[in-house]
């Protein structure tokens, strides 16, 4: 677990769970055909979805120096997506298909975020945009877009944990 003060997380556990997240995210929204590049609802889909960027310390050098910056960024993203997946966008109409892995995905996001942040320690979390689509087709389009950006996010997180497990595990 990542502890305030900067001890290392359980890299191998995080690696396994992040790989599971990748699998779940892709099965929740496989690339069937393609999404439109331009959709007029794009201003509704948040532009503030968390991205892992160069300054976040998630490169090999940054992780060696102080992995806490990167881990905090990943944690923020996990909480952000966990809240979105638990929101009306996913719980409202149209109801999810019976075999949808979104429920498992939601639980795994929470599980990994808890691995990174133990009880009693609170990293700052990113504000969730207030998306309240009134029509079912708006919710459906937002789901696809959220899942697509989640795929990109967990792919980077999985690479971080794979690197950490290989080089930073005690």
């Amino acid at each position: 677990r990542a502890v305030p003060g900067g001890s290392s997380p359980a890299w191998t556990q995080c690696q396994q769970l992040s790989q599971k997240l990748c699998t779940l995210a892709w099965s929740a929204h496989p690339l069937v055909g393609h999404m439109d590049l331009r959709e007029e609802g794009d201003e509704e889909t948040t532009n503030d979805v968390p991205h892992i960027q160069c300054g976040d310390g998630c490169d090999p050098q940054g992780l060696r120096d102080n992995s806490q910056f990167c881990l905090q960024r990943i944690h923020q993203g996990l909480i952000f997506y966990e809240k979105l997946l638990g929101s009306d966008i996913f719980t409202g109409e149209p109801s999810l298909l019976p075999d949808s892995p979104v429920g498992q995905l939601h639980a795994s996001l929470l599980g990994l975020s808890q691995l990174l942040q133990p009880e009693g320690h609170h990293w700052e979390t990113q504000q969730i945009p207030s998306l309240s689509p009134s029509q079912p087709w708006q919710r459906l389009l937002l789901r696809f877009k959220i899942l697509r950006s989640l795929q990109a996010f967990v792919a980077v997180a999985a690479r971080v944990f794979a690197h950490g497990a290989a080089t930073l595990s005690p």
Epitope: V32, G33, H34, M35, D36, E39, E40, G41, E44, E93, P94, S95, L96, L97, S132, P133, S134, Q135, P136, W137, Q138, L140, L141, F144
Partner: antibody, heavy 117, light 112 residues
Framework: EVQLQQSGPELVKTGASVNISCKAS????????IQWVKQSRGKSLEWIGY????????RYNQKFKGKATFTVDTSSRTAYMQFSSLTSEDSAVYFC??????????WGQGTSVTVSS | NVVMTQTPLTLSVTIGQPASISCKSS???????????LNWLLQRPGQSPKRLIY???KLDSGVPDRFTGSGSGTDFTLKISRVEAEDLGLYYC?????????FGSGTKLEIK
């Protein structure tokens, strides 16, 4: 390029049923809803209802309940509308349209249905 | 059901001149999400409808900026600053706020 290709014109007898297809291409089919609209000759447009191409959920205009039935086949990326117990009032052009985030954004070319006695 | 009243029924305009179509709804089209789902379509002769404007004033991609949509609540207007030959056809307003969705009766734009 987004396209909705509808089936050809139909000439049917009073009391019969007709099935109109709307084949989609150029976008992620299951991420969208399909709306159906009626245009009677020389008249305005009437909303019939919609179907989700994700899970098949439907909603009908009260006026067309029991008359129209929507289905979807995700494997062929096709939405269908069946119109039953046809009368001369049902002679019209029927359109399918993709529902974008805010409004119907792409329309099929229309299917003409003529009901004859 | 929400009634959409469009005027005029026919509009005869000289090329290069402006044109204006009014659309009134029997109740407010402001949705609970703060958006107004009022849209305009153009149906050229022998063709299927094509979306021109959505959310009162947003132009669909590829629609020339000589088209503008305005209004709020129950009163809406479509304006063409300078009519061109390709603009002829039937213009419809429609609302997507209340079920069932409803359409105006259409305005036929013809070239003088």
């Amino acid at each position: 390029e987004v396209q909705l290709q509808q089936s050809g014109p139909e000439l049917v007898k009073t009391g019969a049923s007709v099935n109109i297809s709307c084949k989609a291409s150029g976008y992620s089919f299951t991420a969208y809803y399909i709306q159906w609209v009626k245009q009677s000759r020389g008249k305005s447009l009437e909303w019939i209802g919609y179907i989700s191409c994700y899970n098949g959920a439907t909603r009908y205009n009260q006026k067309f309940k029991g008359k129209a039935t929507f289905t979807v086949d995700t494997s062929s990326r096709t939405a269908y509308m069946q119109f039953s117990s046809l009368t001369s009032e049902d002679s019209a052009v029927y359109f399918c349209a993709r529902q974008g985030f805010y409004a119907m954004d792409y329309w099929g070319q229309g299917t003409s249905v003529t009901v004859s006695s | 059901n929400v009634v959409m009243t469009q005027t005029p029924l026919t509009l005869s305009v000289t090329i290069g001149q402006p044109a204006s179509i009014s659309c009134k709804s029997s109740q407010s089209l402001l949705d609970s999400d703060g958006k107004t789902y009022l849209n305009w379509l153009l149906q050229r002769p022998g063709q299927s409808p094509k979306r021109l404007i959505y959310l009162v004033s947003k132009l669909d991609s590829g629609v020339p900026d000589r088209f503008t949509g305005s209004g709020s609540g129950t009163d809406f207007t479509l304006k063409i600053s300078r009519v061109e030959a390709e603009d002829l056809g039937l213009y419809y307003c429609w609302q997507g706020t209340h079920f069932p969705f409803t359409f105006g009766s259409g305005t036929k734009l013809e070239i003088k």
